[in-house]
Interface confidence: low
């Protein structure tokens, strides 16, 4: 025997109480499939979320972030605040980056500069917290005449050593 | 959409040489750290190297002499280019948003098989 | 070079069990460390990257925690698609020596 239920379209429930007829879904709920026993409630957009989608009878709402952050996790579970290029998001907010690091996002976490003598490059553009360092050709291939910027030695953090 | 799209894969003999590319749509690849990362059949994921967004260039010592990570200034790709290659490069190669991110980003790998 | 070193190499479960594999940095990487999740024939998709902050679409069944050099991700409250074998990789590509080494795998088997 076919499910009564099974005609019951998109934007309706199969109602139980009422004799397996199918009922619109009520305000504020929504079915994106057909068949269903009971509607979903819609999802609301509120606080650090904004509507990016209204919910409707079909379909449920969709949210994204204000501005000043952005959205994490599937269908923008969560908002995480943007912080500046040259910042990492922290327990404690956004912080610069450490000497050494940079990050050229407003998300993600701040990396540390290239070394360029680990290729036998010479430093042509510093680092900065925004911006990674640019390395130039070899201190060999450069000219008598030519001039390379050379950075102070970065920060070593304990426990690393060279190879 | 965004997505990482590997190419240039294939059989190629011993000693021989063959240039992969990874070509970005939906985003800017020199926004990002790229890494190539490989996979022998049946092995672990192996890290060959990682063009940093400033156009800068690490590589795995293992990878150090042979391969070359490099970033073409007029297309959205990155490419790697392998010489000398031998019977142990035969692996799916990968091309990856770097994860330091939080929007992290891989290709669906392109075999490379190296045999006579 | 940076070299990761996971444990245990395989493990069987249950559904429902908690799960939790380390992986050891052979220098100090602070926590620029990403755990990936692979099934067969696919690409890998990354779990947790920065040692603890979960990825995109991720469920908050796994986490990861550790600085420094000992690292550890937990998958509480096992389900069948977890089956699949996990890695971790250093990002820290660091002034003194490249990371980016991945650890060897754990395969998670479901009993």
């Known amino acids: 025997l076919q499910d009564p239920c099974s005609n019951c379209p998109a934007g309706t429930f199969c109602d139980n109480n009422r004799n397996q007829i199918c009922s619109p879904c009520p305000p504020n709920s929504f079915s994106s499939a057909g068949g269903q026993r009971t509607c979903d409630i819609c999802r609301q957009c509120k606080g650090v979320f904004r509507t990016r989608k209204e919910c409707s009878s079909t379909s449920n709402a969709e949210c994204d972030c204000t501005p000043g952050f952005h959205c994490l996790g599937a269908g923008c579970s969560m908002c995480e605040q943007d912080c500046k290029q040259g910042q990492e998001l922290t327990k404690k907010g956004c912080k610069d980056c450490c000497f050494g690091t940079f990050n050229d996002q407003k998300r993600g976490i701040c990396r540390p500069w290239t070394n360029c003598s680990l290729d036998g490059k010479s430093v042509l553009v510093n680092g900065t917290k925004e911006r990674d360092v640019v390395c130039g050709p070899s201190p060999a291939d450069l000219s008598p005449g030519a001039s390379s910027v050379t950075p102070p030695a970065p920060a070593r953090e304990p426990g690393h050593s060279p190879q | 959409s965004r997505s990482l799209v590997e190419s240039g894969g294939g059989l190629v003999q011993p000693g021989g040489s063959l240039r992969l590319s990874c070509t970005a749509s939906g985003f800017t690849i020199s926004s990002y750290h790229m890494q190539w990362v490989r996979q022998a059949p049946g092995k672990c994921l192996e890290y060959i190297g990682t063009i940093s967004s400033g156009g800068n260039v690490y590589y795995a010592s293992s990878a150090r002499g042979r391969f070359t990570i490099s970033r073409p200034s007029s297309k959205n790709t990155v490419d790697l280019q392998m010489n000398s290659l031998r019977a142990e490069d035969t692996a799916v190669y990968y091309c990856?948003?770097?994860?330091?991110?939080?929007?992290?980003?891989w290709g669906q790998g392109t075999l490379v098989t190296v045999s006579s | 070079d940076v070299v990761m070193t996971q444990s245990p190499s395989s493990v069987s479960a249950s559904v429902g069990d908690r799960v939790t594999i380390t992986c050891q940095a052979s220098?100090?990487?602070?926590?620029?460390l990403s755990w990936y999740q692979q099934k067969p024939g696919k690409a890998p998709k990354l779990l947790i990257y920065?040692?603890?902050n979960l990825a995109s679409g991720v469920p908050s069944r796994f986490s990861g925690s550790g600085s420094g050099t000992d690292f550890t991700l937990t998958i509480s409250d096992l389900e069948p698609g977890d089956a699949a074998t996990y890695y971790c990789?250093?990002?820290?590509?660091?002034?003194?020596?490249?990371?980016?080494?991945f650890g060897c795998g754990t395969k998670v088997e479901i009993k």
């Open positions: 220098q100090n990487i602070r926590t620029y």
């Open positions: 990789q250093s990002t820290y590509l660091g002034t003194d020596y490249v990371g980016g080494a």
């Open positions: 990856a948003r770097d994860s330091g991110y939080s929007d992290p980003m």
């Open positions: 920065a040692a603890a």
